[in-house]
C-alpha cells in the first residue's frame, strides 16, 4: 500500500506555493518496490526477479506495454503513438 | 565488505534476559531487511526474528515470540534482539543475518530468508544454572 | 516445514544435487563447514556471490529449489541449508540440513 506524502512547502516564494510530494509505500511479505500506472507502488518480487516488467503494469490506463531487448525495463505507448522509455539498472 | 559483527551472549541464568547486539559495516543498513538466525548445539538453523529496513516491521518465530523483541538503530547500523524469560532451549549460537535486497527510499520492505546472503560469525549463548 | 534429503554423497568431479521444496517467495542456500562460520552460496533462487565458485548454481522448478555443484571438490564437504518463508508466507523456515560428502 502506497500513500501520497506532502514533505514540505516553499514559502519562500509568495504568489505560488510550491509542494514536494513523494509516495511512501509498506509492502508486504514477498513484494518489493516497483511502479504500477506509473506511480511508486510494492509488486511481486517474482515480477522483479524474472524481468516481466509489464506483469506491474506500469503504464497509466490505455497506455501499451512493451518489454525492451533483453528486459532492460519497458516502454509505455500512448494512444497517440508516443513512447516513454524506462530502463530499470 | 559487508560485516555483520555480534555480541552480548554468554552464560545466563534461566529466567533471565539477555540483549544482542549486530553492528553493521559496509553497506546501507536501512536499505535491508534484518535477520536473528539461532543455531543449537549439534543441531540446525532456526528462524528467530525479522525486521523490516525502517523497523516498522517485526515478526518472530514461535520459540521465541511474547519473550522476545527484535529492533533496529539505523543511525548506529546496529540490530538488536532483547530476550526474556530464557530457558535452557534457547541456549545455542545466536547469528545476525542480512536480506540482499536494498530497499529504496520512501518504502518499507521486509527481508526474505532466501535472499540472506550475508551472515555474521555469531555470538554464542549458554542459558543454565 | 521443508524437505531437503539429510545426506547426499559424490566423488571429486561428479556433479552432487541437493532439492529442498514446501516454502514460498525465494529459496537460499547456506554453506556450513565444521568450526566455520555461514556462508551463503546461492540466494533469491539463482543469484551467486560474488566470492562463491560458479560450480554452484540454483534453479526454481515450481516450489523446488535445486542446489547444484557441478564438478564436485574436496573443500565443498559441508552441511548445506535452504531457507525459505514457510508456506503461510510470513515467517522463515530452513531446511534440516544435508551434509554433503566428498568420496
Known amino acids: 500500500t502506497c500513500e501520497i506524502v506532502t514533505l514540505d512547502r516553499d514559502s519562500s516564494q509568495p504568489r505560488r506555493t510550491i509542494a514536494r510530494q513523494t509516495a511512501r509505500c509498506a509492502c508486504r511479505k514477498g513484494q518489493i518496490a516497483g511502479t504500477t500506472r506509473a506511480r511508486p507502488a510494492c509488486v511481486d518480487a517474482r515480477i522483479i526477479k524474472t524481468k516481466q516488467w509489464c506483469d506491474m503494469l506500469p503504464c497509466l490506463e490505455g497506455e501499451g506495454c512493451d518489454l525492451l531487448i533483453n528486459r532492460s525495463g519497458w516502454t509505455c505507448t500512448q494512444p497517440g503513438g508516443r513512447i516513454k522509455t524506462t530502463t530499470v539498472s | 565488505a559487508v560485516t555483520l559483527d555480534e555480541s552480548g551472549g554468554g552464560l545466563q541464568t534461566p529466567g533471565g534476559a539477555l540483549r544482542l547486539s549486530c553492528s553493521a559495516s559496509?553497506?546501507?543498513?536501512?536499505?535491508?531487511?534484518m535477520f536473528w538466525v539461532r543455531q543449537a548445539p549439534g543441531k540446525g538453523l532456526e528462524y528467530v526474528s525479522e525486521?523490516?529496513?525502517?523497523?516498522?516491521?517485526?515478526n518472530y518465530g514461535s520459540a521465541v515470540k511474547g519473550r522476545a523483541t527484535i529492533s533496529r538503530d539505523n543511525g548506529q547500523s546496529t540490530l538488536y534482539l532483547q530476550m526474556n524469560s530464557l530457558r535452557a532451549e534457547d541456549t545455542g549460537t545466536y547469528f545476525c543475518?542480512?536480506?540482499?535486497?536494498?530497499?529504496?527510499?520512501?518504502?518499507?520492505?521486509?527481508?526474505?530468508?532466501?535472499?540472506?546472503?550475508?551472515w555474521g560469525h555469531g555470538t554464542e549463548v549458554i542459558v543454565s544454572s | 516445514a521443508l524437505t531437503q534429503p539429510s545426506s547426499v554423497s559424490a566423488n571429486p568431479g561428479e556433479t552432487a544435487k541437493i532439492t529442498c521444496s514446501g516454502g514460498?517467495?525465494?529459496y537460499g542456500w547456506f554453506q556450513q563447514k565444521p568450526g566455520s562460520a555461514l556462508v551463503t552460496v546461492i540466494y533469491?533462487?539463482?543469484e551467486r556471490p560474488s566470492d562463491i565458485p560458479s560450480r554452484f548454481s540454483g534453479a526454481l522448478s515450481g516450489s523446488t529449489n535445486t542446489l547444484t555443484i557441478t564438478g564436485v571438490q574436496a573443500e565443498d564437504e559441508a552441511d548445506y541449508y535452504c531457507?525459505?518463508?514457510?508456506?503461510?508466507?510470513?515467517?522463515?523456515?530452513f531446511g534440516a540440513g544435508t551434509t554433503l560428502t566428498v568420496l
Open positions: 559496509g553497506f546501507d543498513f536501512s536499505s535491508h531487511g
Open positions: 531457507g525459505t518463508e514457510d508456506i503461510s508466507g510470513t515467517a522463515g523456515v
Open positions: 525486521i523490516t529496513n525502517d523497523g516498522s516491521g517485526t
Open positions: 543475518a542480512r536480506s540482499n535486497y536494498a530497499c529504496p527510499g520512501g518504502f518499507s520492505c521486509w527481508g526474505d530468508t532466501g535472499q540472506i546472503d550475508a
Open positions: 533469491w533462487d539463482d
Open positions: 514460498v517467495y525465494s
